[in-house]
């Protein structure tokens, strides 16, 4: 598939009627990240996607109890994911279903990035990277 | 009509090769990712390995890792399971799926397989 | 490598509850899916994302989850549904696919 398909919805126009934000988080871990989805319409539930690395094929994202939420307001939808770990690392996608016309909107995705270092050896790694 | 088709099972010695097929139609192809799943007789169902929609990732279960290569090509609208040094407990039932647990490139996803074809390791 | 586990067997008689369960570590953070699969037969798929039922699906099945745990549940089990169900998810990466054992379901 090219590229440029990845961020098309079903009626090809690329992520439109969604306006995705921010398109990438850089924390460490333990913090809380926030990532918002902006619509032009309300009349449609939206749910979020995830997939690790760009490549790969998305799935529904399963919200962990006490640590990942997901709120709705007309037309602003966000998802906050509280004690960020490095399996949560990968791209976020919203995704609105509209009521009327069963279309399937997405927006162009967030990346997360959760740093911090897990090991020593890692540690080094960064170190002599930056020399 | 949207469908999947595998061919290539055959009877193979131990120690040999064989390459199963699994032609797709009535749907865009290279937007999915797809799978090969094996049931062996009197056995549950295993996942054997699974490609991104273009081809560039590919995953293996740990059974099969080193020994089978799943690729595609996407001009054929084919998923391919290259199978070599093949053993007794390879003997099962092959089928080619998509999997709704992965969604498209567009967010979408159904759920598909093939009708199986059925590879016997034996001597 | 991951597992999921489900019971080798249920038995229920036509009309009664049958209910089948699936525990694997990474449940509280990835969906199930269940199949009935019938021998000779590509499997069915009967619920997506733990509780979603395909449409075509009767309503007698049914999905839950909580915690490692997820359960398909048959209301009111008929003849017709004697076959084999797998759950099956995928590791926290997301990108191996896991079937679990397999639960043969009699309905006496």
């Known amino acids: 598939a090219r590229s440029e398909d990845r961020y098309r919805n079903p009626k090809g126009s690329a992520c439109s009627r969604i306006w995705q934000s921010p398109r990438f988080i850089a924390r460490k871990r333990g913090f809380t990240v926030k990532m918002h989805c902006y619509m032009n319409s309300a009349s449609g539930n939206v749910s979020w996607l995830w997939k690790q690395e760009m490549d790969e094929n998305p799935q529904q994202l399963k919200l962990e109890k006490g640590r990942m939420e997901e709120s709705q307001n007309e037309s602003l939808a966000t998802l906050t994911i509280q004690g960020i770990r490095f399996e949560d690392n990968g791209i976020y996608f919203c995704q609105q279903k509209c009521n009327n016309t069963s279309e399937v909107y997405q927006g162009c995705g967030t990346e997360l990035r959760v740093m911090g270092f897990s090991t020593l050896a890692q540690l080094k790694q960064r170190n002599t990277l930056k020399d | 009509e949207v469908q999947l088709v595998e061919s290539g099972g055959d009877l193979v010695q131990p120690g040999g090769s064989l390459r199963l097929s699994c032609e797709a139609s009535?749907?865009?192809?290279?937007?999915?990712?797809m799978n090969w799943v094996r049931q062996a007789p009197g056995k549950g169902l295993e996942w054997v390995s699974g490609?991104?929609?273009?081809?560039?990732?590919?995953y293996y279960a740990d059974s099969v890792k080193g020994r089978f290569t799943i690729s595609r090509d996407n001009s054929k609208n084919t998923l391919y399971l290259q199978m070599n040094s093949l053993r007794a407990e390879d003997t099962a039932v092959y089928y080619c799926?998509?999997?709704?647990?992965?969604?498209?490139?567009?967010?979408?996803?159904?759920?598909?397989w093939g009708q199986g074809t059925m590879v016997t390791v034996s001597s | 490598s991951y597992e999921l586990t489900q019971p080798p067997s249920v038995s229920v008689s036509p009309g009664q509850t049958a209910r089948i369960t699936c525990s694997g570590d990474?449940?509280?953070?990835?969906?199930a899916y269940w199949y009935q699969k019938k021998s000779g037969q590509a499997p069915v798929l009967v619920i997506h994302?733990?509780?979603k039922r395909p449409s075509g699906i009767p309503e007698r099945f049914s999905g839950s989850s909580s915690g490692t745990m997820a359960t398909l549940t048959i209301s009111g089990a008929q003849v017709e549904d004697e076959a084999d169900y797998y759950c099956f998810s995928t590791d926290r990466s997301g990108n191996h696919v896991v079937f679990g054992g397999g639960t043969k379901l009699t309905v006496l």
């Open positions: 490609i991104s929609g273009s081809g560039g990732t590919t």
């Open positions: 009535g749907f865009t192809f290279s937007n999915y990712g």
């Open positions: 990474a449940l509280p953070k990835k969906y």
């Open positions: 799926a998509n999997l709704l647990l992965w969604l498209g490139y567009h967010g979408d996803g159904f759920d598909l």
């Open positions: 994302e733990d509780s």
